[in-house]
């Protein structure tokens, strides 16, 4: 059933028109070619459509000669350019990603069949749903000028101004599939900027082609105000390389997009060189600003830096006589003020008001380096007191009432001697388990201890054990971090193992061997020896994502995500940097729940002395990364099955 009436018209083109119609009880799109359209054009499109069957390509259902027509599946949500112009609000980050992924999937399939598409643009991307986990979201349409390509490439100038590669626009130059990759880069740019460039292109059509051909496209984030998306921005740059050989292939583009990290890495900020960040703390989630305080410096000086995540503005000042090792944010709701407490290597506790940096003073000096700080929140109500807890390198735990941080030279309420010079108190942690709301845990030397709001030690667990087998040498090492859920997860100096201890039985109940997981990932490449891997797998930091995942950062720059309930590996983010230093969850203004990961990159500097320059790098991750890994894996699996089914059907 088919009527060439204006109300059924879906679109017009140089070839003819597309109408909504019914075919075998299904809604379809019928492409009617102009009377003067050559049969060659129809045949060409037929050849392509008949031989290619893929979830990312519009399927041909039937064809007719009089009138010349193609019957194809109908995309209920229209074209991508319509969405970009009329319904930007629907374009969530996940949906943006899935559209790009599906188009890249179709493109690599066409390229594997030696076909250059030559007219990739938002108008030719059709949408079937806006549900981001649907198996079919976007498909490539309009094969009018797709062409089989011999190894040498083709010469004719085709495509649409503003959406084509420089070598295509120039004409009379041989080009190949890499021209489509350039167009894909533009498509990705348009998805990221929700079509800002296209709107301007309609106003200034002459400049539209010029800008993109000359590689003068404005920075998507600065110019169009879209949220940063580091790995997508990088991919756009790669696709838009002037030299086609320098662009990734469509298969490589698909592989890059097929990554949860790409979706969830929302910021990557390089800090000034040789600012070696030791610790960080995020501003209170009630704050309007998404900002972070960073503690750094060298042995003889301490720097406190402030980073505004919205503007990426960075300020730094020397505040102490020695390196800052730890930071805490003390929020006083009654006074409606917040203070940053810096613990230094020399034992100084420096307190600075977050609103007025001139308001600053020191508390009573500690007897050794301040190795950890924690502002507990035993009570969210103001009736019960909250405390600032200070751990030192000589094993002491100093307890300050939170309100006293405002007072110069304030002394602690109480000092507990838990360890000694050989056993530093390295970490303090609150349980994420709701049944243990008022319990704090810490690590001192090789012991784990717990206490509640009366500050009497409840449990003292000695973690020296002969059960570490090949890692027995690390059993005597000092604990550097403890995180607590239903179990205790501890990491020790230089050890590549996370020990899991049962709180009730006080026994070792599991080992998470990072070397094992890293070897699984790198076994194909056979990259590193066991010793090297043990060193690069040494655990530097742990972070618990409640009821979801354990994040492990290693000294070799890898991030491991483990499912909390099964302790199975979800993902290894391999060689993320040279060394991971700090990981913490935060609620940052409009960024909502995020994981902040701070790492170091070492670069060899020029010159004869192979001195390594260290650069700190802060990354912000969407907290949903563990879920996204699993969602994307499922998504890809479903699409693989679909592609296989379509391939089998076409053979039959």
């Amino acid at each position: 059933e088919f009527e060439q009436a204006p109300e059924f018209l879906l679109g017009d083109g140089s070839f003819g028109s597309v109408y909504r119609a019914a075919y075998e009880g299904e809604e379809v799109a019928v492409k009617i070619f102009n009377k003067h359209t050559s049969l060659r054009l129809l045949r060409q499109e037929l050849v392509v459509l008949c031989h290619l069957h893929h979830p990312s390509l519009i399927s041909l259902l039937a064809a007719g000669i009089r009138p010349r027509m193609l019957v194809m599946e109908l995309a209920s949500k229209g074209s991508l350019d319509r969405l970009l112009q009329q319904d930007k609000a629907s374009l969530t980050r996940t949906l943006q990603h899935r559209i790009a992924l599906h188009v890249a999937d179709g493109l690599r399939y066409l390229h594997s069949a030696m076909i250059i598409y030559r007219d990739l643009k938002p108008h030719n991307v059709l949408l079937f749903t806006l549900y981001p986990n649907a198996a079919i979201i976007a498909k490539i349409a309009d094969y009018g000028i797709a062409q089989y390509c011999c190894r040498m490439g083709i010469k004719t100038s085709e495509g649409t101004p503003g959406f084509r590669a420089p070598e295509v626009a120039r004409g009379n130059v041989i080009y190949n599939q890499q021209a489509d990759v350039y167009s894909f880069g533009l498509l990705l740019y348009d998805i990221l900027t929700t079509g800002g460039r296209i709107v301007e292109g309609l106003k200034f059509p002459n400049e539209f082609d010029e800008l993109e051909i000359q590689g003068k496209l404005p920075d998507p984030v600065k110019e169009y105000g879209c949220a940063p998306w580091p790995m997508v921005e990088k991919l756009i740059k790669q696709c838009l390389k002037e030299n086609p050989q320098e662009r990734p292939t469509s298969a490589q583009v698909f592989d890059i997009l097929n990554s949860a990290e790409l979706v969830c890495l929302t910021r990557r900020i390089l800090l000034p060189k040789n600012v070696i960040v030791e610790c960080m703390v995020a501003t209170h989630h009630n704050s309007r600003n998404a900002s972070i305080w960073l503690g750094c410096g060298h042995t003889d000086r301490g720097q406190l830096s402030f980073l505004d995540l919205n503007t990426e503005g960075y300020t730094s000042e020397e505040v102490a006589d020695s390196r800052i090792l730890c930071l805490a944010l003390v929020h006083l709701p009654v006074e409606k003020e917040s203070w940053i407490v810096s613990g230094t290597q020399s034992g100084t506790l420096l307190v600075i008001n977050t609103e007025d940096g001139k308001k600053r003073h020191t508390l009573e000096k500690m007897t050794d380096s301040v190795t950890c700080l924690y502002c507990n929140s035993f009570s969210k109500q103001s009736k019960q007191k909250n405390f600032l807890l200070v751990g030192t390198a000589d094993g002491k735990l100093a307890i300050f009432e939170d309100k006293t941080v405002k007072l110069k030279g304030a002394a602690p309420l109480k000092i507990l001697n838990i360890g000694n010079v050989s056993t530093p108190l390295m970490c303090l942690s609150e349980s994420t388990n709701s049944t243990e709301r008022n319990v704090m845990w810490g690590g001192c030397g090789t012991k784990i201890f717990s206490f509640s709001n009366d500050f009497t030690i409840q449990k003292l667990i000695e973690t020296r054990t002969s059960q570490l087998f090949s890692y027995a040498a690390f059993s005597d090492s000092n604990i550097i971090t403890v995180v607590v859920d239903t179990a205790l997860y501890i990491a020790k100096q230089n050890s590549p193992v996370v020990e899991v201890w049962d709180k009730k039985t006080e026994k070792l109940c599991g080992l998470i061997d990072c070397v094992h997981f890293l070897r699984e990932v790198t076994v194909k490449e056979n990259k590193e020896s066991k010793h090297k891997m043990s060193y690069s797998g040494r655990v530097k930091t742990l972070c618990l994502q409640k009821n979801t995942a354990l994040w492990i950062g290693t000294g070799g720059g890898h991030i491991l995500l483990l499912d909390l309930s099964t302790r199975r590996l979800i993902r290894v983010i391999y060689n993320f940097c040279n060394s991971v230093r700090v990981m913490m969850t935060a609620q940052l203004g409009s960024l909502k729940n995020v994981m902040l990961v701070l790492g170091y990159n070492r670069k060899n500097t020029e010159g004869t002395q192979k001195q390594k320059e260290i650069q700190s790098c802060l990354t912000v991750w969407d907290i949903n990364l563990p879920h996204e890994v699993q969602n994307l894996e499922k998504h890809i699996e479903v699409r693989k099955e679909l592609a296989e089914k379509m391939r089998r059907t076409s053979v039959e």
Epitope: H298, L325, D368, S369, T371, N494
Partner: nanobody
Framework: QVQLVESGGGLVQPGGSLRLSCVAS????????MGWYRQAPGKQRELVAL???????NYGDSVKGRFTISRDNAKNTGYLQMNSLKPEDTAVYYC???????????WGQGTQVTVSS
């Protein structure tokens, strides 16, 4: 990466003295604590002495009153002055350094000390 080189070991008669040095080099941005440990054949490695950044010290029971640990922060060097040496002090002496917020640990290759007449 921090490299540690120990020196000053050797053969000494009972009652004699030796001074061990440990020099740290490489990517150093903060050395927190320096320590000396020793391992005699067939025995476990044990703490000899430890010094904090502020100069706080800790000694193994068997060397208290005879050994003194010190450090020169400007030179990234640690020292162990060993007096009234006994045959049971014979061991390989290792230097250990903690860097970067106490989470990184680096060990030297060791220097042999033999006390014998």
């Amino acid at each position: 990466q921090v490299q540690l080189v120990e020196s000053g070991g050797g053969l000494v008669q009972p009652g004699g003295s030796l001074r061990l040095s440990c020099v740290a080099s490489g990517t150093i941005y903060a050395i927190n604590r320096m320590g000396w440990y020793r391992q005699a054949p067939g025995k476990q490695r044990e703490l000899v002495a430890l010094i904090t950044l502020g100069g706080g010290t800790n000694y193994g029971d068997s060397v208290k009153g005879r050994f003194t640990i010190s450090r020169d922060n400007a030179k990234n060097t640690g020292y162990l002055q060993m007096n009234s040496l006994k045959p049971e002090d014979t061991a390989v002496y290792y230097c250990k350094v903690e860097s970067s917020g106490y989470t990184d640990v680096f060990w030297g290759q060791g220097t042999q000390v033999t006390v014998s007449s």
